[in-house]
Interface confidence: low
């Protein structure tokens, strides 16, 4: 999947079709039982808004351990004292006080906008994800199409999308480029990364969700 | 008003190498969003996607034709390229350049160019 | 890769018909599905993305209907231009994969 922010989609974004369960053989970029059908189903309470996108987070974190599983398997990256030497080379989204996530100054509206941001920023990551994985090539697809799935949601839940800044497609682009010309170490490391700060990013969004 | 326009040898002999270019007016191949396609049809009416080179430069192909394939381009000519070694009769086909905006569609198509391969 | 297979792979129809093309992909592709049309000779030209959204000045004619797996190409009151064979794309990932066609002919 080559897409770098959600600014590329045409007028219907991909609208809700995304919802739809993929092939047992394929992970879904939802839950399993988050199917349209089933969420409509007389005999199960449909989920609110709230629950699927807590439900939807905790289903990309279990991707994610799935990936970072691989990763330190293949490599001694996830020991590594050497982090901070290919973090410099990285712009990865961190929460900070002044985004209003956490229990100290929460803020829901400012908070909103960081999480969609982050996540529309952690998009080009993701993709550059994608052909990093062999046995777990499919858990990255999953990861990287929930995690649109998730963006899709939450802009529903966002009441002031004008604060939400799309990452410029040319940027990442060439951000893209770069990060793939690295050499094998730092293109491990760089992975390993990505996993670990989406991980942190994405716990530390449950967290102040769910405070929503 | 944006237009492709492909250009190569039409008859190549096997194992020998096909270069077809394509010439793009209209928008710089270096524009935001796009990527820029080859894709060929062969007799019976059959696409097949080979790859595509994004704005930036950077380039996915098809896995099944990696191994024969390069695209490269050129921003100052404003063309982007595609070289096919070790042809045979099964890469006789009309090979389309295209323009798609990433996740979106292919809006532009070049009018194709025939390619024979045969001794 | 995914299979992308359409029906009928020719039809004949007269104009002022309606007609419709199905599309059904081997794996989920939610509505990452593109139509096109292609006339004798010509290149490919786009009619609907999306699964279905009509491309710029395609006439309302025509309508793409599913996600998922399961996609069709409806075209109402067929006019003399509609003739000619339409291909499903989909661009879920790579590689790209097409279906093998659907010739629509004058009756």
């Known amino acids: 999947m080559n897409s770098f922010s959600t600014s590329a989609f045409g007028p219907v974004a991909f609208s809700l079709g995304l919802l739809l369960v993929l092939p047992a053989a394929f992970p879904a970029p939802v839950p399993p039982g988050e199917d349209s059908k089933d969420v409509a189903a007389p005999h199960r309470q449909p989920l609110t808004s709230s629950e699927r996108i807590d439900k939807q987070i905790r289903y990309i974190l279990d991707g994610i351990s799935a990936l970072r599983k691989e990763t330190c398997n293949k490599s001694n990256m996830c020991e590594s004292s050497k982090e901070a030497l290919a973090e410099n080379n990285l712009n990865l989204p961190k929460m900070a006080e002044k985004d209003g996530c956490f229990q100290s100054g929460f803020n829901e509206e400012t908070c909103l906008v960081k999480i969609i941001t982050g996540l529309l920023e952690f998009e080009v990551y993701l993709e550059y994800l994608q052909n990093r994985f062999e046995s777990s090539e499919e858990q990255a697809r999953a990861v990287q199409m929930s995690t649109k799935v998730l963006i899709q949601f939450l802009q529903k839940k966002a009441k002031n999308l004008d604060a939400i800044t799309t990452p410029d497609p040319t940027t990442n682009a060439s951000l893209l480029t770069k990060l793939q010309a690295q050499n094998q170490w730092l293109q491990d490391m760089t992975t390993h990364l990505i996993l670990r700060s989406f991980k942190e990013f994405l716990q530390s969004s449950l967290r102040a969700l769910r405070q929503m | 008003d944006v237009q492709l326009q492909e250009s190569g040898p039409g008859l190549v002999k096997p194992s020998q190498t096909v270069s077809l270019t394509c010439t793009v007016t209209g928008i710089s191949i270096t524009t935001g969003n796009y990527r820029w396609s080859w894709i060929r049809q062969f007799p019976g009416n059959k696409l097949e996607w080979i790859g595509y080179?994004?704005?930036?430069?950077?380039?996915t192909y098809n896995p099944s034709l990696t191994s024969r394939t390069t695209i490269t381009r050129d921003t100052s000519m404003n063309q982007f390229f595609l070289e096919m070694i070790s042809l045979t009769a099964e890469d006789t086909a009309t090979y389309y350049c295209a323009r798609d905006r990433y996740d979106y569609a292919v809006d532009f198509w070049g009018q194709g160019t025939s390619v024979t391969v045969s001794s | 890769d995914i299979q992308m297979t359409q029906s009928p792979a020719s039809l004949s129809a007269s104009v002022g018909e309606t007609v419709t093309i199905t599309c059904r992909s081997s794996?989920?592709?939610?509505?990452?599905l593109t139509w096109f049309q292609q006339r004798q000779g010509k290149s490919p030209h786009l009619l609907v993305y999306?699964?279905?959204t009509l491309a710029e000045g395609v006439p309302s004619r025509f309508r793409g209907r599913g996600r998922g797996t399961q996609f069709s190409l409806q075209i109402n009151s067929l006019q003399p231009e509609d003739f000619g064979t339409y291909y499903c794309q989909h661009h879920y990932g790579t590689p790209w994969t097409f279906g093998g066609g659907t010739r629509l002919e004058i009756k």
């Open positions: 999306y699964a279905n």
């Open positions: 080179i994004y704005y930036s430069g950077a380039i």
């Open positions: 794996e989920n592709i939610y509505s990452f």
